[in-house]
């Protein structure tokens, strides 16, 4: 799996999970979130060469097409596969609110 | 939806469905498929600017992150959303076989 266990231990130019810490205030302009101040969002990036973690039949076909037609611009792309939620604490006036935000943290990647 | 109805009628630099006809023999080296000789596989390509058909909360966050931090390399990618199968006819000796190959045709795209 193209997850932290594999990608963070290997220098990998191909599609892999990349570390990315997002500070809510500085990076997104969201000043109203009380906790956490930021989180490890991560992201997916890297090349998708022939059969590198292909997600669907179409991405496998596209991968092969690119190998045979290297001048082609049609190639699979490295995107998130497994995502996890993030729980935040904020205030509505003096009232604390806890919200679970779905699909906020990327745990693994794929070529799609 | 970033599908043929929208993308094939509009000149669009952003993430959109692109036409791609794949000839099994010429483009993939698959000489054994009897019918069809090829098919409209299509593919997804184009930029994923702020809020262009963002797929998940993470891709929205990444999109916003990129808007505020334009030097960042972390950006969503244009990939397939809806896929359809393709039915092929091939022969095992003289015996015709019909097979439905899943996820072979891209019908729409998304930024993920």
């Amino acid at each position: 799996a193209l997850d932290a266990a594999y990608c963070f231990r290997n220098v990998q130019d191909n599609c892999c999970l990349r570390p990315l810490y997002i500070d809510f205030k500085r990076d997104l302009g969201w000043k109203w979130i009380h906790e956490p101040k930021g989180y490890n969002a991560n992201f997916c990036a890297g090349a998708c060469p022939y059969l590198w973690s292909s997600d669907t039949q179409h991405s496998r076909v596209l991968s092969l097409y690119n190998t045979i037609n290297p001048e082609a611009s049609a190639s699979p792309c490295c995107v998130s596969q497994d995502l996890e939620p993030l729980t935040i604490l904020y205030y509505i006036g003096k009232t604390p609110k806890i919200e679970q935000l779905s699909n906020m943290i990327v745990k693994s990647c794929k070529c799609s | 939806a970033l599908d043929a109805a929208y993308c094939f009628r509009n000149v669009q630099d952003n993430c959109c469905l692109r036409p791609l006809y794949i000839d099994f023999k010429r483009d993939l080296g698959w000489k054994w498929i009897h019918e069809p000789k090829g098919y409209n596989a299509n593919f997804c390509a184009g930029a994923c600017p702020y809020l262009w058909s963002s797929d998940t909360q993470h891709s929205r966050v990444l999109s916003l992150y990129n808007t505020i931090n334009p030097e960042a390399s972390a950006s969503p990618c244009c990939v397939s959303q809806d896929l359809e199968p393709l039915t092929i006819l091939y022969y095992i000796g003289k015996t015709p076989k019909i097979e439905q190959l899943s996820n072979m045709i891209v019908k729409s795209c998304k930024c993920s």
Epitope: L28, G29, W30, K31, W32, Y90, Y91, I92, G93, K94, T95, K97, E99, L101 | Y50, L51, Q57, R60, V61, L64, T67, I68
Partner: antibody, heavy 121, light 107 residues
């Protein structure tokens, strides 16, 4: 230039629903909370609720709870307010107003031009 | 809910004079070192516009003839050298507690 442009005046029958839109431009829609405020003829301002467009998180004034629904379309940077079970007391100008940005519940620094909703049988 | 009471309900001021509007909250709107009180002006036929943020901070683009003061439950908006263009209804607003609430307005 920050702009909030609301949909036009509506005339509705009692018991019906109305949906008012607020198309924004000139700022990053996903960065700010969007509030809705109503003003009955010759009266003051009543805060109805708010939405954070990035996630669709909402916070409603209990006075309107159950009758008002706030939504947002991030692809078009448009916020919506739907009010159901309309009655004569809902005749008012409805405003969308952008939150200042420092707190979830905050002052409002940009306002739409307002949408007059009339309820009449 | 916090109730905001403005006085006077209406006010007539001659040009170049100073106008003062008071706003009293039913309970303190101070938290974390801030006073969560704001002032707006709604000119005839227009939408409200923010004048003062957090009790005393002048909003960008607003004339420095407007000033705000106060803390806890008692707040004041002052308009010096009043002009005809200042005509309208002035509202105070608190966001210290949910639901956010406005005063009834001073004309």
């Amino acid at each position: 230039e920050v702009q909030l442009v609301q949909s036009g005046a509506e005339v509705k029958k009692p018991g019906a629903s109305v949906k008012v839109s607020c198309k924004t431009s000139g700022y990053i829609f996903m960065k700010y909370w969007m509030n809705w405020v109503r003003q009955a003829p010759g009266a003051g301002l009543d805060w109805m609720g708010q939405i954070f467009p990035a996630w669709g998180m909402t916070n409603y004034n209990e006075m309107f709870e159950g009758r008002v629904t706030l939504t947002a379309d991030t692809s078009t940077s448009t916020a919506y307010m739907e009010l159901s079970s309309l009655r004569a007391g809902d005749i008012a100008v409805y405003y969308c107003a952008r939150g200042y940005g420092n707190y979830a519940l905050d002052a409002m620094d940009y306002w739409g031009q307002g949408t007059l909703v009339t309820v009449s049988s | 809910d916090i109730v905001m009471t403005q006085t006077p309900p209406s006010l007539s001021v001659s040009p170049r004079e100073t106008a003062s509007i008071s706003c009293r909250a039913s309970e303190s709107v101070d938290s974390y070192g801030n006073s969560f009180m704001h002032w707006y002006l709604q000119k005839p036929g227009q939408s409200p516009q923010l004048l003062i943020y957090l009790a005393s901070n002048l909003e960008s683009g607003v004339s420095d003839r407007f000033s705000g003061s106060g803390s806890g439950t008692d707040f004041t908006l002052r308009i010096s050298r009043v002009e005809a263009n200042d005509t309208g209804v002035y509202y105070c607003q608190q966001n210290d507690e949910d639901p956010l609430s406005f005063g009834q307005g001073t004309k």
